[in-house]
Interface confidence: medium
């Protein structure tokens, strides 16, 4: 996250790190007791590693009752991803159990109707991805406010040139912005889960390349297929 | 550039060895598990042999047809992946493809293959 | 083993026409963690074989929307809507759920 701060220790239950061989890899939103939500690009890479997903944490490397690390049982990343797209980056996560709920651990609701949010809308995006273009991994978990952007302005020649379907939102990116390794992490709009953080190799905090994000509302159908 | 070359077939005889070698590169080798499959001309295709990762114990697995006979090893050190022949059959003819293992798929890039001959 | 059988061996089509190849496996296909690892690769003359589909119905990278997969637990399909003429070769499917992992015998697709 650039630009943020440390986000409020466990305020938000829902927030996922997916782990590959015990490292921090990708954001992850806990939206059903035994799936987390991420971004399918995140594991493209992951070959032969151990998958596995942490919940309950505000601190990566330091000891918090609520941590609890869990392997994975399945990995479903959405039929239409591509290696070379942004297009449908979506991951579903089966955990090996049920996670232990409490009030540092919660699903989190997500938007089922496929309605745009409104431009300028503040929501927020966590994530223990970078905090400066010099790559700084921070411990703890970060967190900022950004207003959404309209579709036609981000669509822009100048911006990301028609690249943005009705399937993806952006938000703005004025030294404020997500970043690599907050890919698959949630932007929560009015308590709500409206959209995944994709994970493309964007470049982060400059206001002519927007943050995307998929939209969690026009892909119901699929994740209530997978969570069925 | 992904790429996997591999070398080391030939011709042998029956009840012979051959080593197969397969360079890799463009990619982080030591994280991927690797395959051998093998095509005997004019057949189809046949899964040979697997080999995991370091983090997965370098877990190997066989086709029945080569157990006890064939064994894959790997060296990430110089992103190399080998295949051991030992008691070689006619059967074993083929052209002898080196694969990389996805995440979530299985063969996303193959080798062009090296021809293996056992004749007497 | 699991045995997969594919059929038609040979498929010949008119370029345009749609193509259909099934593919069945002697047993059930779902992995213990509930993964299909159904895939189908092309092989082109002369060339080394080539991903397209993925647990099931999955398009690999630059795929065309043509192609598409269907199925579950022992019956699948690869279709392709429209055939064009760099498509032409030998398909085959692979099930990686259960080793030893095993590839179907192959579907020649040719121009009638």
């Known amino acids: 996250i650039l630009g943020g701060r440390e986000a409020e220790a466990h305020a938000r239950p829902y927030m996922a790190s997916v782990q590959l061989n015990g490292a921090h890899l990708c954001g992850g939103v806990l939206v059903a007791e035994q799936w987390v939500l991420s971004a399918a690009h995140c594991l493209e890479d992951a070959a032969d590693g151990k998958v596995q997903v942490l919940l309950g944490a505000h601190s990566l490397s330091q000891p918090e009752p609520s941590k609890r690390l869990y392997d994975v049982l399945r990995a479903v990343p959405h039929p239409d991803s591509q290696p070379d797209t942004i297009d449908h980056d979506l991951l579903l996560l089966q955990l090996s159990e049920k996670a232990t709920l409490g009030p540092a651990v919660r699903p989190l609701p997500w938007q089922r109707v496929d309605r745009d949010v409104a431009p300028g809308t503040l929501c927020d995006v966590a994530g223990w991805g970078i905090v400066n273009h010099a790559g700084r991994r921070p411990d703890s978990l970060q967190h900022v406010l950004l207003p959404v952007l309209d579709r036609a302005t981000c669509n822009r020649r100048t911006h990301h040139d028609g690249a943005i379907t009705e399937r993806l939102m952006c938000a703005e990116s004025n030294r404020r912005d997500s970043c690599k390794g907050d890919s698959g992490g949630p932007l929560v709009c009015g308590g709500v889960l409206e959209g995944v953080v994709t994970s493309g190799s964007r470049v982060c905090g400059n206001r002519k390349k927007p943050g995307i994000y998929t939209r969690v509302a026009s892909y119901a159908a699929w994740i209530d297929s997978v969570l069925a | 550039e992904v790429q996997l070359v591999e070398s080391g077939g030939g011709l042998v005889q029956p009840k012979g060895s051959l080593k197969l070698s397969c360079a890799a590169s463009?990619?982080?080798?030591?994280?991927?598990?690797m395959n051998w499959v093998r095509q005997a001309p004019g057949k189809g295709l046949e899964w040979v042999a697997r080999?995991?990762?370091?983090?997965?114990?370098?877990?190997?697995y066989y086709a029945d047809s080569v157990k006890d006979r064939f064994t894959i090893f790997r060296d990430d050190s110089e992103s190399m992946l080998y295949l051991q022949m030992n008691n070689l059959k006619t059967e074993d003819t083929a052209m002898y493809y080196c694969?990389?293992?996805?995440?979530?798929?299985?063969?996303?890039?193959w080798g062009t293959g090296t021809t293996v001959t056992v004749s007497s | 083993d699991v045995l997969m059988t594919q059929n038609p061996l040979s498929l010949p089509v008119s370029l345009g026409d749609q193509a259909s190849i099934s593919c069945r496996s002697s047993?059930?296909?779902?992995?213990?963690?509930?993964?299909?690892?159904l895939e189908w690769y092309l092989q082109k003359p002369g060339q080394s074989p080539n991903l397209l589909i993925y647990?099931?119905?999955n398009r690999f990278s630059g795929v065309p929307d043509r192609f598409s997969g269907s199925g579950s637990g022992t019956d699948f399909t690869l279709k392709i809507s429209r055939v064009e003429a760099e498509d032409l070769g030998v398909y085959y499917c692979?099930?990686?759920?259960?080793?030893?992992?095993?590839f179907g015998s192959g579907t020649k697709l040719e121009i009638k």
């Open positions: 694969v990389r293992h996805g995440y979530y798929w299985y063969f996303d890039v």
């Open positions: 463009g990619f982080s080798f030591n994280t991927y598990a």
């Open positions: 080999i995991r990762s370091k983090s997965n114990n370098y877990a190997t």
């Open positions: 047993q059930s296909i779902v992995h213990s963690n509930g993964n299909t690892y």
């Open positions: 647990n099931v119905f």
């Open positions: 692979f099930q990686g759920s259960h080793v030893p992992y095993t």
